[in-house]
C-alpha cells in the first residue's frame, strides 16, 4: 500500500463568546485537513480526533466518526470544529481577549488532531501538531495558512 | 508617570472592615487592569485578586473570598479594597499593582509593571 | 495552586560580583514568570518579564532565564543598589503565586 497523507492546512474560522459573569471565553475554531489517498483503492476516513491546547493546558476537543471515504488517487478537504474553554485558572485571557486598549487579540493555540483510516480490514492513524494564532476578541475568517505561528513582543500600549 | 497612591496606615479593631484606596494616575485606569497582594510580616507576598476597571469583574484567589471585596470608581480612577472580619491574621502590608499584558503578533504574558507604595493595616483590640 | 519554590532565601555578596537566585514551579508554567525588586520606602519594581525579557528601563545587568518549572535571576556586576529583596511570581494560571523571597546582602 502507498501513503496516505494527512495535511493540516490551518484555522479557517474562529467564533467567539463571553460569559461576563464567569470571565469565561468560548471559543468555536473550524480547521481544515487535506487528506490525500495514494493509493488504487478507496479508503475510508473513520474518525478524526482533534484537540486543543493553550499554555500547555488542553482547552477543547473534539471527534468526528464515519466521515467520507476517499477514492483512489484522490484528496479530499475536510474541515472539523473544535469547541473550547477558556475558563477557571485560565480566565485572566477574559481580560486580555475583551480589553479595547489592547490592540492585538491573538493567542497562540497548539492545534492536535489525529486521522484514522482503514483499506481491507486495516487501520492506519496519522497525526498532526501545529501552532496557531486565533483571535479571542472578536469573530474571524481567515484565509488559509494565515493563522500559522511566528513571534515578536510589545507590551501593552 | 504612572503612580498608584494608597492611603496611610490602619490600625482596626477585630471583626472590624477597613477599605484600602488606591488611587491610579498617569495613565487611563480603565485601560489595565489591577491586582492585589498582602505581605504578612517577615512572610513573602500572596495574591488576593484582580478586577478589571471597564466591567467592575473580578476573580479572587480562593484563600480571600469572602475576605476581601475589589471594587472600582472609575471616575475618581480609584481601585478600592474592602476587608472584613478582620483578626490578628489580616495584619499585613497590602498592596496595589498595575496589571499589562505584553503582546505583539499575540499574548506574551503579563506582570504588575507599577505598585503602590503599600498600605499596613494593623489589627489590634 | 502552583507552588513556587525560590533559593536561596538569603544571599551574602559583594559589588562586583555576579549571583543568580533560582525559582522552580511545582508544574510546567511555560515561560509565564516575572521578577521583582523591593527595596524599603520604594515601590516594588518590575525587572523580568515572561521569563526572559528585561523591563524597560531595567538595567541589562539583570538577566532572566528558563521556561517549563526552572528559572534564574542573574545579576552581573551587582551594584551597591542592587542589594535588595526580590521575588518571582507565576502567572500561568490562577491563583498568581510568587516565591518566598531571597534577600540579597552586602557581604
Known amino acids: 500500500p502507498r501513503s496516505i497523507d494527512v495535511k493540516y492546512i490551518g484555522v479557517k474560522s474562529a467564533y467567539v463568546s463571553y460569559d461576563v459573569q464567569k470571565r469565561t471565553i468560548y471559543l468555536n475554531i473550524t480547521n481544515t485537513l487535506n487528506i490525500t489517498n495514494n493509493n488504487y483503492y478507496s479508503v475510508e476516513v473513520e474518525n478524526i480526533t482533534a484537540q486543543v491546547q493553550f499554555a500547555k493546558t488542553v482547552i477543547g476537543k473534539a471527534r468526528l466518526n464515519n466521515i467520507t471515504h476517499i477514492g483512489p488517487l484522490d484528496m479530499k478537504q475536510i474541515d472539523y470544529t473544535v469547541p473550547t474553554v477558556i475558563a477557571e485558572e485560565m480566565s485572566y485571557m477574559y481580560d486580555f481577549c475583551t480589553l479595547i486598549s489592547i490592540k492585538v487579540h491573538n493567542i497562540v493555540l497548539m492545534m492536535q488532531v489525529t486521522v484514522t483510516t482503514t483499506y481491507f480490514g486495516h487501520s492506519e492513524q496519522i497525526s498532526q501538531e501545529r501552532y496557531q494564532y486565533v483571535d479571542c476578541g472578536r469573530n474571524t475568517t481567515y484565509q488559509l495558512g494565515q493563522s500559522e505561528y511566528l513571534n515578536v513582543l510589545q507590551p501593552q500600549q | 508617570e504612572v503612580q498608584l497612591q494608597q492611603s496611610g496606615p490602619e490600625l482596626v479593631k477585630p471583626g472590624a472592615s477597613v477599605k484600602i484606596p488606591c488611587k491610579a494616575s498617569?495613565?487611563?485606569?480603565?485601560?489595565?487592569?489591577m491586582d492585589w497582594v498582602k505581605q504578612s510580616p517577615g512572610k513573602s507576598l500572596e495574591w488576593i485578586g484582580h478586577?478589571?476597571?471597564?466591567?467592575?469583574?473580578?476573580f479572587y484567589n480562593q484563600k480571600f473570598k469572602g475576605k476581601a471585596t475589589l471594587t472600582v470608581d472609575k471616575s475618581s480612577s480609584t481601585a478600592y479594597m474592602e476587608l472584613r472580619s478582620l483578626t490578628s491574621e489580616d495584619s499585613a502590608v497590602y498592596y496595589c499593582?498595575?496589571?499589562?499584558?505584553?503582546?505583539?503578533?499575540?499574548?506574551?504574558?503579563?506582570?504588575?509593571?507599577?505598585w503602590g507604595q503599600g498600605t499596613s493595616v494593623t489589627v489590634s483590640s | 495552586d502552583v507552588q513556587i519554590t525560590q533559593s536561596p532565601s538569603y544571599l551574602a555578596a559583594s559589588p562586583g560580583e555576579t549571583i543568580t537566585i533560582n525559582c522552580r514551579a511545582s508544574?510546567?508554567?511555560?515561560?509565564?514568570l516575572a521578577w521583582y525588586q523591593e527595596k524599603p520606602g520604594k515601590t516594588n519594581k518590575l525587572l523580568i518579564y515572561?521569563?526572559?525579557t528585561l523591563q524597560s528601563g531595567i538595567p541589562s545587568r539583570f538577566s532572566g532565564s528558563g521556561s517549563g518549572t526552572d528559572f534564574t535571576l542573574t545579576i552581573s556586576s551587582l551594584e551597591p543598589e542592587d542589594f535588595a529583596m526580590y521575588y518571582c511570581?507565576?502567572?500561568?494560571?490562577?491563583?498568581?503565586?510568587f516565591g518566598g523571597g531571597t534577600k540579597l546582602e552586602i557581604k
Open positions: 478586577i478589571n476597571p471597564n466591567d467592575g469583574g473580578t
Open positions: 508544574k510546567s508554567i511555560s515561560k509565564y
Open positions: 498617569g495613565y487611563t485606569f480603565t485601560d489595565y487592569t
Open positions: 499593582a498595575r496589571w499589562v499584558y505584553y503582546y505583539g503578533i499575540s499574548y506574551e504574558g503579563g506582570a504588575m509593571d507599577y
Open positions: 515572561s521569563g526572559s
Open positions: 511570581q507565576q502567572h500561568n494560571e490562577y491563583p498568581w503565586t
